[in-house]
Amino acid sequence: GGGGSKHKCVQNSLVNNETLESIMNTLESEEDFRKYFYYLEGSK
């Protein structure tokens, strides 16, 4: 069990003026990376 407070979606982070690179540097899990690249694909 367990888990944690789910991270805010990438779009929210961008609103906070975080760069894509700084977001990339924080990714930890496979799911984190999958969501990140899904967002990048969707923003093209």
């Epitope: 888990g3 944690g4 407070s5 991270h7 930890e28 899990s29 496979e30 990376f33």
Partner: antibody, heavy 119, light 107 residues
Framework: QVQLVQSGGGVVQPGRSLRLSCAAS????????MHWVRQAPGKGLEWVAV????????HYSDSVKGRFTISRDDSKNTLYLQMNSLRAEDTAVYYC????????????WGQGTLVTVSS | DIQMTQSPSSLSASVGDRVTITCRAS??????LAWFQQKPGKAPKSLIY???SLQSGVPSKFSGSGSGTDFTLTISSLQPEDFATYYC?????????FGGGTKVEIK
């Protein structure tokens, strides 16, 4: 069930090196980032380092940067902490810990392994 | 770095007491706060995540609240097994940082 079993602690002289291991089971180890946290005798908890899925991202506390290296071997489901140029202030119990991803809390911890740096 | 300040650093309480521990972040961390319990010679045990969500298997006598910079952990009715040290931790950003701990002792 999730298990994180640590090994590699011991007594080492200042300036020498030591490698800690954390063997994981009960979950898809390769899919998750892993952390090291330490606790000096009688003191509080201090975050040390993190390694992401695939080893893509690594971050360290300022106190160990340039001396410690975090790594992983997904084929062995094992996390490592290579500690070089050890100092007396590195004496602590070291814990490995797992969380689901960035901005998630730790859900599982290893049992801890004591590193004593002394001449 | 985000500093986490816990208070009190220690407290004495009796079985059955309601105990509250506070944790303050030096800057806003939304609800990215966890609480851990640690007994001597043991690894920390995760109690609460997301400031107020109970980890699986943790009894409901533990509760957490707060958001932004101010947080609390409450034990509604202290039991003998609850005498331990409690730590808060922010996981909003690297480096992850912990409070200094609160030791809950028997009065």
């Amino acid at each position: 069930q999730v298990q994180l079993v640590q090994s590699g602690g011991g007594v080492v002289q200042p300036g020498r090196s030591l490698r800690l291991s954390c063997a994981a089971s009960g979950f898809s180890f390769s899919s998750f980032g892993m952390h090291w946290v330490r606790q000096a005798p009688g003191k509080g908890l201090e975050w040390v380092a993190v390694i992401s899925y695939g080893g893509i991202n690594k971050h360290y506390s300022d106190s160990v940067k340039g001396r410690f290296t975090i790594s992983r071997d997904d084929s062995k489901n094992t996390l490592y902490l290579q500690m070089n140029s050890l100092r007396a202030e590195d004496t602590a119990v070291y814990y490995c810990a797992k969380r689901e991803g960035y901005r998630y809390a730790y859900d599982y911890w290893g049992q801890g392994t004591l590193v004593t740096v002394s001449s | 770095d985000i500093q986490m300040t816990q208070s009190p650093s220690s407290l004495s309480a009796s079985v059955g007491d309601r105990v509250t521990i506070t944790c303050r972040a030096s800057q806003g961390i939304s609800n990215y706060l966890a609480w851990f319990q640690q007994k001597p010679g043991k690894a920390p045990k995760s109690l609460i995540y997301g400031a107020s969500s109970l980890q699986s298997g943790v009894p409901s006598k533990f509760s957490g609240s707060g958001s932004g910079t101010d947080f609390t952990l409450t034990i509604s009715s202290l039991q003998p097994e609850d005498f331990a040290t409690y730590y808060c931790q922010q996981y909003n950003s690297y480096p992850l940082t912990f409070g200094g701990g609160t030791k809950v002792e028997i009065k």
